[in-house]
């Protein structure tokens, strides 16, 4: 079991990244499926290595004060969502704007029916060319 | 099926990193094997897990305005290259240079003598000391 | 064979950094075990995936001149202690300070009773909220 | 053993105020995402809100986000719940719970909330 989705831009204002089934993707099986292009949803209870690249492109002057962070996340059924993994990188000082990559990786439990996602604070600096932004995870 | 293979400083100008087998390296069998000290080629068709690691150390006044990017890069047999993954950052301001590293990883269907490379605006700029660039796949 | 766990921050002076099983943690059997709270040891021979993030908030003015360097290193039985794998970073010019995350990972072949633990230049410089560094492993 | 003591239940009129406390005993409270779930006369469990072991990160079900906040005390084993503009659907028996891994493994006895004029 394992998915390799790429990152897709939205007109959304939500601070889920949108991804998609296209370009060099990876959809094992059907034990596994991406849904509302927003989450990776599991059948099978297990132990899973989940990872999730983001890159973008920010400026310390036009952006918060607060650094860019993404948070890969966890939803079980009939649970509340949680953070498993965060990282976290300050603006760039460059102009327009400074691009720079975060990854995130981890082994976790899921039960049946849990889905993750990628949550990040200011989706609209997500940089969506070839390669850049991904999501997948693999059964152990 | 494991592989993993430590960077190797290169006279050569090409822009694709070169790695060797030494130091505290993997090659798990000859299902992966290192080809010409630039790619990893697999002989079985199945999905894997690639990773690559590329520690830098830059400035923004003596490089270009173009973000250092490292791409993992993928060369079926009969078919064009094509980019699996990118990651980008910004040069530093600190003097001479700043060091950044950037991780890529993901999981990828792989074609029997499909070779795996790693590809950076700057080879030059790459830090070749102890544990800082490195590159590998196992197969799930 | 697999684990996660948590960082935690300590008195200690040491610069290597502390875990525990606490939050979203995993400990698939006692084929690998957090060793006081430093080192994630493992009871069988093979392949590991092990990996790492760091998340940490420093400033040039406030830091030394060296970069912000997290290692990977490996303790096997009877031998001296090795880096396997290294990542650098250099410090924020944001005030008070700027948080960046590094990630760490590779294939290794590890011995029975091995250890492997995450070195820093600067304990006090990591980033402990939910989420931001942990550390882990898993067996091919 | 682990023990987890509820209390701080009671009536309470619409718009008023509650404090509910966990009191934790029996293994290391600050190792362990802690929840307040509720179980309404008739219904099924609901979970109405999470804090992770650090106290940094707060998590809640939309129907008691903006009125409700979660806290901890690590250094007294205590978890708490601030309930602010009750209504009448919160009625229910209030239960702290210890989590593990994305399971519930140990939880309290209940305490009472009514909330009616």
């Known amino acids: 079991i394992a998915a390799h989705v790429i990152s897709e831009a939205s007109s959304k204002t939500t601070s889920v990244l949108q991804w998609a089934e296209k370009g060099y993707y990876t959809m094992s099986n059907n034990l596994v499926t991406l849904e509302n292009g927003k989450q990776l949803t599991v059948k099978r209870q297990g132990l899973y290595y989940i990872y999730a690249q983001v890159t973008f492109c920010s400026n310390r002057e036009a952006s918060s004060q607060a650094p860019f962070i993404a948070s890969l996340c966890l939803k079980s059924p009939g649970r509340f969502e949680r953070i498993l993994l965060r990282a976290a990188n300050t603006h760039s000082s460059a102009k327009p704007c400074g691009q720079q990559s975060i990854h995130l990786g981890g082994v976790f439990e899921l039960q049946p029916g849990a889905s993750v996602f990628v949550n990040v604070t200011d989706p609209s600096q997500v940089s969506h060319g070839t390669g850049f932004t991904s999501f997948g995870l693999l059964k152990l | 099926i494991a592989a993993h293979v430590i960077s190797e400083a290169s006279s050569k100008t090409t822009s694709v990193l070169q790695w060797a087998e030494k130091g505290y390296y993997t090659m798990s069998n000859n299902l992966v094997t290192l080809e010409n000290g630039k790619q990893l080629t697999v002989k079985r068709q199945g999905l894997y897990y690639i990773y690559a690691q590329v520690t830098f150390c830059s400035n923004r006044e003596a490089s270009s305005q173009a973000p250092f990017i490292a791409s993992l890069c993928l060369k079926s047999p009969g078919r064009f290259e094509r980019i699996l993954l990118r990651a980008a950052n910004t040069h530093s301001s600190a003097k001479p240079c700043g060091q950044q590293s950037i991780h890529l990883g993901g999981v990828f269907e792989l074609q029997p003598g499909a070779s795996v490379f790693v590809n950076v605006t700057d080879p030059s700029q790459v830090s070749h000391g102890t544990g800082f660039t490195s590159f590998g796949l196992l197969k799930l | 064979i697999a684990a996660h766990v948590i960082s935690e921050a300590s008195s200690k002076t040491t610069s290597v950094l502390q875990w525990a099983e606490k939050g979203y943690y995993t400990m698939s059997n006692n084929l690998v075990t957090l060793e006081n709270g430093k080192q994630l040891t493992v009871k069988r021979q093979g392949l590991y995936y092990i990996y790492a993030q760091v998340t940490f908030c420093s400033n040039r003015e406030a830091s030394s001149q060296a970069p912000f360097i997290a290692s990977l290193c490996l303790k096997s039985p009877g031998r001296f202690e090795r880096i396997l794998l290294r990542a650098a970073n250099t410090h924020s010019s944001a005030k008070p300070c700027g948080q960046q995350s590094i990630h760490l990972g590779g294939v290794f072949e590890l011995q029975p009773g091995a250890s492997v633990f995450v070195n820093v230049t600067d304990p006090s410089q990591v980033s402990h909220g939910t989420g931001f560094t942990s550390f882990g492993l898993l067996k091919l | 053993e682990v023990q987890l003591l509820e209390s701080g239940g009671g009536l309470v009129q619409p718009g008023g105020s509650l404090r509910l406390s966990c009191a934790a005993s029996?293994?290391?409270?600050?190792?362990?995402?802690m929840s307040w779930v509720r179980q309404a006369p008739g219904k099924g469990l609901e979970w109405v809100s999470g804090i992770e072991p650090l106290g940094d990160v707060t998590y809640y079900a939309d129907s008691v986000k903006g009125r409700f906040t979660i806290s901890r005390d690590n250094s007294k084993n205590t978890l708490y719940l601030q309930m602010n503009s009750l209504r009448a659907e919160d009625t229910a028996v209030y239960y702290c719970?210890?989590?593990?891994?994305?399971?519930?493994?140990?939880w309290g006895q209940g305490t009472l909330v009514t909330v009616s004029s």
């Open positions: 719970a210890k989590e593990a891994s994305g399971d519930f493994d140990y």
């Open positions: 029996g293994f290391t409270f600050d190792k362990y995402l």
